[in-house]
């Protein structure tokens, strides 16, 4: 069988402050079993954004129905984007174990945040 690949099709995404950002991620195989996690940044200081198996991530929702047994789409939407959310986001497949071990990472998607459009009031 072909080895699982993690595909993040977008190199970069630009979102206006206050809007939602959709970060796309698909995997090419359901095996090996293990959770998907999203991180901002790389290395030991990376920040966990979403963990498929546990945790409370109030600003994050999955784009597809993740409880489908055949689901391969692990795209997420992050609401109410602020400049502090800018960075590179990685979709990472883990392989089950004690503890789970990182198996394959996507190439990353750089999120940039545009200033919220200002509303000019015209007086007539």
């Amino acid at each position: 069988e072909e080895e699982l690949q993690v595909i993040q099709p977008d190199k970069s995404v630009s979102v206006a402050a206050g809007e939602s950002a959709i970060l796309h991620c698909t995997v090419t195989s359901l095996i090996p079993v293990g959770p998907i996690q999203w991180f901002r940044g790389a290395g030991p200081a990376r920040e966990l954004i979403y963990n498929q198996k546990e945790g409370h991530f109030p600003r994050v929702t999955t784009v597809s129905e993740s409880t489908k047994r055949e689901n391969m789409d692990f795209s997420i939407s992050i609401s109410n984007i602020t400049p502090a959310d800018a960075g590179t986001y990685y979709c990472v497949k883990f392989r089950k174990g004690s503890p789970d071990t990182e198996f394959k990472s996507g190439a990353g998607t750089e999120l940039s945040v545009r200033a919220k459009p200002s509303h000019h009031h015209h007086h007539h």
């Epitope: 359901l30 129905e65 409880t67 489908k68 047994r69 004690s98």
Partner: antibody, heavy 118, light 109 residues
């Protein structure tokens, strides 16, 4: 507290139909996949149906495929199992169970007994 | 017939350690769980995801895996642990939930 309460069991003749219900409370029902698991008298557990959280995708083992239909009404926090063309070997206690993120079971109902007999 | 294999019975004295094994699934495509069932009662989940214990389950119940075999270990067995124990799985390659045939744990004495 998570609660799952099954109902609808009873005695039915071979070839007959029955619909089981499972009322869920204590958690966000619409966020969890659900399953039905049965246990024949004196026998082990057997998974008979699963459904995704939104209800669009359903799963069955070969033993019941084409005869059983799992469905859900998220507005009523209720899971269903429609059983048609029932056979004597379908006699069992039927449990509804909540699924974990990886489709194992973490909470179970108390079960409802279905007896298929003439 | 059951897709997962576990011993039909295990006997242990109070205070001893009981181990129940389960095999039959592919490591790369399976997750396992352990369920306890006492006579006339519904199953209770003891372990899920091979080795995760729900918060309401005593610490004396633990799960481990080695290759294609998973093990339920009950340390310091108590009389109330006498029950049937089922190994259950989720098989990602077939989208199914196989079970083992169950193991009857007898607490001696």
């Amino acid at each position: 507290e998570v609660q799952l309460v099954e109902s609808g069991g009873g005695v039915v003749q071979p070839g007959g139909s029955l619909r089981l219900s499972c009322a869920a409370s204590g958690f966000t029902f619409s966020s969890n996949a659900m399953s039905w698991v049965r246990q024949a008298p004196g026998k082990g557990l057997e998974w008979v149906a699963g459904i995704s959280a939104g209800g669009s995708d359903t799963y069955y083992p070969a033993s019941v495929k084409g005869r059983f239909t799992i469905s859900r009404d998220n507005s009523k926090n209720t899971l269903y199992l429609q059983m048609n063309s029932l056979r004597a070997e379908d006699t069992a206690v039927y449990y509804c169970a909540r699924e974990t993120w990886n489709h194992l079971f973490d909470y179970w109902g108390q079960g409802t007994l279905v007896t298929v007999s003439s | 017939s059951y897709e997962l294999t576990q011993p039909p019975s295990v006997s242990v004295s109070p205070g001893q350690t009981a181990r129940i094994t389960c095999s039959g699934g592919s490591y790369s495509s399976y997750y396992y769980a352990w369920y306890q069932q006492k006579p006339g009662q519904a199953p209770v989940t003891l372990i899920y995801s091979d080795d995760k214990r729900p918060s309401n389950i005593p610490e004396r119940f633990s799960g481990s895996s080695s290759g294609t075999t998973v093990t339920l270990t009950i340390s310091g067995v108590q009389a109330e642990d006498e029950a049937d124990y089922y190994c259950g799985g989720y098989d990602q390659s077939s989208y199914t939930n196989p079970f083992g045939g169950g193991t009857k744990l007898t607490v001696l004495g």
